[in-house]
Amino acid sequence: MRRGPRSLRGRDAPAPTPCVPAECFDLLVRHCVACGLLRTPRPKPAGASSPAPRTALQPQE
């Protein structure tokens, strides 16, 4: 599984590299990591009180 640069400390690591489809780049640790799918719920029907909070699909455990 391709991850990202491995040899450098967190504060010195290079810019993001492409990740495999099930992963995304974590700017904090400068590595490709497992990622779930982010989703924004459909807007509520007219007259609904407040906008639905944004949620996410959990990463595969």
């Epitope: 640790v29 990591v33 779930g36 990463p59």
Partner: antibody
């Protein structure tokens, strides 16, 4: 069920060493970065260290740099925090936590979603 | 390192109140801010990540907003179980740093 269980805390004299363990179940630590966060009695949260999924990269808070070492053993699905040259100010509850990521345009949007129950480290003579 | 400054450090509120906690970063962190709730003797719980995304299972009365340097956690109608300490954390640049916490107490 995702779970993190810390162990290894206890009472140690100044200058001593301890190794904390963080055993993960319900997910593989090779998929997420693992972090140690501590909380001194009556104080706020202080991040201590992280290790990347591959175990190849680490980073440390300035307060522990050169004294603490974080590592991960993917075969045991366990992360470790080796603490040397302990000081009174290292007294705290130590938590390990998993950083979860969601894909936002190829970049992680996330936070620390699962935490262990904490293990108390007391440094005192 | 990036400093995260929370305000207020504590507040007193009643059940049903709308509560707002703010967090200011010492430099631009985009939307890489999470909010946690902690009760005495317990581990923190993730509420909000990426500034405005509600974590799974968290009640919708919690919401987050902001980007750049200024961030807000809002509890729309405070419930008895919400009395706790709340922390912000930036994860844009290592080391990830926490705010000093805001204790929400019963008025």
């Amino acid at each position: 069920e995702v779970q993190l269980v810390e162990s290894g805390g206890g009472l140690v004299q100044p200058g001593g060493s301890l190794r904390l363990s963080c055993a993960a179940s319900g997910f593989t630590i090779s998929s997420n970065s693992i972090h140690w966060v501590r909380q001194a009695p009556g104080k706020g949260l202080e991040w201590v260290a992280w290790v990347t999924p591959s175990g190849g990269s680490t980073d440390y808070a300035d307060s522990v740099k050169g004294r603490f070492t974080i590592s991960a053993d993917t075969s045991k699905n366990t992360a470790y925090l080796q603490m040397n040259s302990l000081r009174a100010e290292d007294t705290a509850v130590y938590y390990c936590a998993r950083r979860v990521c969601y894909n936002r345009l190829g970049v992680c949007a996330g936070g620390m979603d699962y935490w262990g129950q904490g293990t108390l480290v007391t440094v005192s003579s | 390192d990036i400093q995260m400054t929370q305000s207020p450090s504590s507040l007193s509120a009643s059940v049903g109140d709308r509560v707002t906690i703010t967090c200011r970063a010492s430099q631009d962190v985009s939307t890489a801010v999470a909010w946690y709730q902690q009760k005495p003797g317990k581990a923190p719980k993730l509420l909000i990540y990426s500034a405005s995304f509600l974590y799974s299972g968290v009640p919708s009365r919690f919401s987050g907003s902001g980007s750049g340097t200024d961030f807000t956690l809002t509890i729309s109608s405070l419930q008895p179980e919400d009395f706790a300490t709340y922390y912000c954390q930036q994860s844009r640049i290592s080391p990830p740093t926490f705010g000093q916490g805001t204790k929400v107490e019963i008025k």
